[in-house]
């Protein structure tokens, strides 16, 4: 190995002034070959028996044993310099003429060959005894990634020769490899923050800063773990890393205290039906802790109600819930609250919502069906069902009539307005059975159909009939 020295920005003329290692006279002019990657030997020179890279006569094993050993000359062993400075270093070797076969010098770093556009120049100094070769390597504006062990390799008579390593140490300000990270913590609960920075140069010492005040006036060796016993309010933490080159500062991170969420906002009714209301909301600030679930509170807005609140729980997302099993044509007050691990938010502002009219809950009553043979029609009569206020306003009826005979089936329906309680429908098929059912209609929809009433339509004028399936109390229809 070479001697360990510290130097920066060594110039070539400084580094290589004076006689070269070995034997060359000072006035002997070298010739140079710049290279982008692999070094090449020069063209054949006087005094050389064979040009490089040409086949040479094989040296017998006895002869090769007699060849003097060849090795790279000792050079500088350790270069220490600051980031962004320039550095130059070299390998040199003396090859006697007795060596017939040599390959170019290649540069290696940390065991890998340096290929590509590296700034390397090879200089050759031939004389009557052989040739001295100097491989120069330079790095402009060094970076941390240039740190490492550099060495030269060369093949001489098929034997690989390796130089002593030149260790390049690029020093700079501390470099953070782990910075503190933002966390959300429970009030008065301990937590840890980590900061790690590296050189070279080492050591790196860490100071912690909380809200622009130093936590420790005595630094800690990197890596440093700061245990914070607990906070009652949001704080900003950072760390300072110091080494012999100066100091650097990490990013500042906010440590937030988890609190209950803010109440949801913008509670809206997206859709109402007779018995359900679809409600949406915008979650409030989560209090630095994820929302877990939400609660929809519903109370009847009518003065006569007893003020009891129905509660519906749902997941925090999506911010949407369909409240079901509500009364038709009713007014409700609705509010939303959400919770995180700390607790429930206050409720949102209450909003008013209404369900729409319901469909009738009972079928028309006292249905009778009579065949008017002369006009070839069915005469259908019924009584209006008892419709509640929430069932809405009666708008009409739907009459379903099904005709069945051997090989024929016909299903038809008619809608009639609410005026009156009778209807006439033309006979569709003779020698058939007609089944009639009637449902009331409001704006809220169609109510249940009545029980079926069957009537047999004869081929000629004989008529059978069935009474209404819903006779009025105390009555029996007969015709």
């Amino acid at each position: 190995g070479g001697t360990a020295e510290k130097w920066e920005e060594t110039e070539l003329d400084q580094l290589f002034s004076g006689p070269l290692p070995g034997r060359l006279p000072v006035n002997h002019r070298p010739f140079s070959a710049p290279h982008s990657s692999r070094d090449q030997l020069p063209p054949p020179q006087t005094g050389r028996s064979h040009p490089a890279h040409t086949a040479a006569p094989q040296v017998t094993s006895t002869a090769s044993k007699l060849l003097p050993p060849v090795a790279f000359n000792h050079t500088i062993g350790h270069i220490v310099l600051s980031e962004h400075k320039n550095v130059k270093f070299n390998c040199s070797i003396n090859i006697p003429n007795t060596y017939q076969e040599t390959a170019g010098i290649s540069w290696w770093k940390d065991g890998k060959e340096l290929l590509g556009a590296h700034h390397s120049i090879t200089q050759f100094y031939p004389d009557e005894e052989g040739v001295s070769i100097i491989a120069l390597f330079s790095i402009a504006s060094v970076q941390r990634s240039d740190n490492g062990s550099y060495f030269c390799k060369m093949k001489v008579n098929n034997r690989e020769i390796v130089s002593d390593p030149i260790y390049v140490e690029v020093q700079g300000l501390p470099y953070f490899i782990k910075q503190p990270e933002s966390v959300n913590v429970t009030r008065n609960t301990a937590f840890n923050l980590t900061c790690q920075a590296v050189g070279p140069p080492e050591p790196v010492n860490i100071f912690w800063v909380q809200n622009s005040s130093r936590v420790n006036e005595k630094p800690e060796r990197s890596p440093s773990v700061l245990t914070v016993p607990g906070l009652t309010e949001t704080a900003v933490f950072s760390c300072e890393a110091h080494n012999d080159k100066g100091l650097t500062v990490s990013k500042g991170v906010h440590i937030n205290i988890k609190v209950i969420p803010s109440p949801p906002t913008e509670v809206h009714i997206l859709n109402s039906t007779a018995h359900s209301i679809l409600v949406s909301w915008v979650p409030g600030f989560d209090g630095y802790s994820p929302l877990q679930n939400c609660s929809i509170q519903v109370k009847e807005a009518d003065r006569l109600s007893n003020g009891s609140v129905m509660v519906f729980n749902t997941s925090a997302s999506p911010h949407l819930y369909e409240i079901q099993q509500l009364q038709a044509l009713a007014n409700y007050s609705i509010a939303v609250s959400c919770r995180n691990e700390i607790g429930w938010s206050a409720v949102s502002p209450w909003i008013l919502a209404s369900t729409t009219e319901g469909a009738p809950s009972v079928a028309p009553l006292n249905i009778t069906v009579f065949l008017n043979e002369s006009n070839n029609i069915l005469d259908i009569r019924w009584t209006k069902p008892p419709i509640k206020r929430q069932d809405g306003e009666l708008v009409g009826y739907r009459i379903s009539h099904v005709w069945e005979s051997a090989g024929t089936y016909k299903e038809l329906s008619e809608e009639v307005s609410q005026n009156g309680s009778w209807a006439q429908i033309p006979v569709q098929i003779h020698n058939a059975t007609c089944t009639v059912r009637i449902a009331a209609i409001t704006k809220g929809g169609i109510g249940p159909f009545s029980e079926p009433v069957n009537i047999i339509i004869p081929e000629h004028s004989k008529v059978d009939y069935a009474p209404s399936s819903t006779p009025a109390p105390g009555n029996t229809d007969s015709m």
Partner: antibody, heavy 121, light 112 residues
């Protein structure tokens, strides 16, 4: 080569304020801190505290908390010491010194030439 | 605060002769990692202080090797093997182990 150049002497009345500047050159200002040191007439040196030139975070020795404020203008590589409600006993030479924590501890390696502040009615 | 006591206050010396300054601290300056942050400053007449020595005995760059430092725990010494004219001034010890940093009262070296 790092150089710290301080502002000129100041003569102030008690109760007034003074702002001493320390302009740095020859190095990246934000890669170190600045300590402030007081030397009263015929007395020794007193460390007042230091400021991180990158973050502006300051630390003050107990005797210099309250009326003494360190500040920065990184755009002109300058550190400042402001003293308010001046008293006669604030009469001293105030030094700035480059500072950070190296392998040998706090460095104090380059010093300004000092600024004399005289407080007299 | 750690009190740093220097002696003597004044040290008249003959050129070419040795000089020795003592510095004692009220608490040990050895820190938990085994380092002792005891430093020396030199203040020549009419000049700013200059860093002379750190970690008890390490010379700052450019400081002649006639200066040396020794000591441990609470007792420390700065020695000048052969005083030269340029060594005239006040020498301060200071500690950086404990907060706040504190200085000794200074020792004035003058030529007899």
């Amino acid at each position: 080569q790092v150089q710290l150049v301080q502002s000129g002497s100041e003569l102030k009345k008690p109760g007034a304020s003074v702002k001493v500047s320390c302009k740095a050159s020859g190095n990246t200002f934000t890669t170190y801190g600045m300590s402030w040191v007081r030397q009263a007439p015929g007395q020794g040196l007193e460390w007042m505290g230091w400021i991180n030139n990158y973050s502006g975070v300051s630390t003050y020795a107990d005797d210099f908390k309250g009326r003494f404020v360190f500040s920065l203008d990184t755009s002109v590589s300058t550190a400042y010491l402001q003293i308010s409600s001046l008293k006669a006993e604030d009469t001293a030479v105030y030094y700035c010194a480059r500072d950070y924590y190296g392998s040998g501890g706090w460095v104090f390696d380059y010093w300004g030439q000092g600024t004399t502040v005289t407080v007299s009615s | 605060d750690v009190v740093m006591t220097q002696s003597p206050l004044s040290l008249p010396v003959t050129l070419g002769q040795p000089a020795s300054i003592s510095c004692k601290s009220s608490q040990s300056l050895l820190d938990s990692e085994g380092k002792t942050y005891l430093n020396w400053l030199q203040q020549r007449p009419g000049q700013s202080p200059r860093r002379l020595m750190y970690l008890v005995s390490k010379l700052d760059s450019g400081v002649p090797d006639r200066f040396s430092g020794s000591g441990s725990g609470t007792d420390f010494t700065l020695k000048i093997s052969r005083v030269e004219a340029e060594d005239v001034g006040v020498y301060y010890c200071w500690q950086g182990t404990h907060f706040p940093r504190t200085f000794g009262g200074g020792t004035k070296v003058e030529i007899k």
